[in-house]
């Protein structure tokens, strides 16, 4: 039975040209996290594997940095970075947990962070 929940940074916004940290946290389970995949819509951005460490997709290497922790840092943001991001936690023995973050990249200097929320 999957008892865990994923807490994410929720709906967030950031300025064009700036950077943002995407964070997810798995709680309420003793399952072992074997790997976390980060996806942007239908693109694999990065993977953090418990044994192998980080792999950043080559096409994102210039603008994506691993961490902090299991999170992901997006740099040199453009308006095209606006959209959904997913953290996919592969765990044993529970299985897969998925969290969703919506990022809006703003032209203006006003960028508010949304409230944290949980996805069961």
């Amino acid at each position: 039975m999957m008892t865990g929940t994923i807490e994410t940074t929720g709906n967030i916004s950031a300025e064009k040209g700036g950077s943002i940290i995407l964070q997810c946290h798995l709680s309420s389970t003793t399952a072992q996290v074997t790997q976390v995949n980060w996806e942007q819509q239908d693109q694999l951005l990065a993977i953090c594997n418990a044994d192998l460490g980080w792999h950043i997709s080559p096409s994102f290497k210039d603008r994506v940095a691993p961490g902090p922790g299991l999170g992901l840092t997006l740099q040199s943001l453009t308006v095209n970075d606006t959209g959904e991001y997913f953290c996919i936690y592969h765990t044993y023995p529970d299985g897969t947990y998925t969290g969703r973050i919506f990022l809006e990249v703003l032209e203006s200097s006003v960028a508010e962070h949304g409230a944290r929320f949980q996805i069961p």
Partner: antibody, heavy 118, light 107 residues
Framework: EVQLLESGGGLVQPGGSLRLSCAAS????????MHWVRQAPGKGLEWVSS????????SYADSVKGRFTISRDNSKNTLYLQMNSLRAEDTAVYYC???????????WGQGTLVTVSS | DIQMTQSPSSLSASVGDRVTITCRAS??????LNWYQQKPGKAPKLLIY???SLQSGVPSRFSGSGSGTDFTLTISSLQPEDFATYYC?????????FGGGTKVEIK
Amino acid sequence: EVQLLESGGGLVQPGGSLRLSCAASGFTFSSYSMHWVRQAPGKGLEWVSSISSSAGYTSYADSVKGRFTISRDNSKNTLYLQMNSLRAEDTAVYYCARVPYDVWLDYWGQGTLVTVSS
Amino acid sequence: DIQMTQSPSSLSASVGDRVTITCRASQSISSYLNWYQQKPGKAPKLLIYAASSLQSGVPSRFSGSGSGTDFTLTISSLQPEDFATYYCQQSYSTPLTFGGGTKVEIK
């Protein structure tokens, strides 16, 4: 240099058993998921089974479930496939492959031929 | 199970030609799509992983694109050593499944 070397193939009668081995070298074997893939003569590739780095998780194709068992010995850098109740349709070249991040099969062995025939 | 459909099943081309092979998944697989090259009597060789990432040591004339359900492998200028069979494979979910293969032959 990454190397995977399969062994244990051969001719076996229907209903018989074989154990395939895959000896790994040139990388930290215990950090990688490993898979078996087979290819019947003149046919395409068919995934058979996988095992996680610590051997905590295994998975099988429906066609072999209950008959084949994948295992590994990280102290010996070796992957195994125990094949029981073999059928004619199991005749194929069996490849072991290294699978970083459980996504792509980046190194393959040269394959070992299993022939099931009376 | 996710079905992978490759087309064409075979094609004839000349050295220097631009070759395109397509692969369609029966459901969305994000970018969990890999391409392999296999020559007769040899093991498959990884060319492209995660839809568009070029495996180390693979010539840059090979490229991959697509996401969701539709993917493409392109060889920009076919070389004599590229005549082989090419397979796509999804790793979105188990069982892992392969396309039926595309045999690239000399015209």
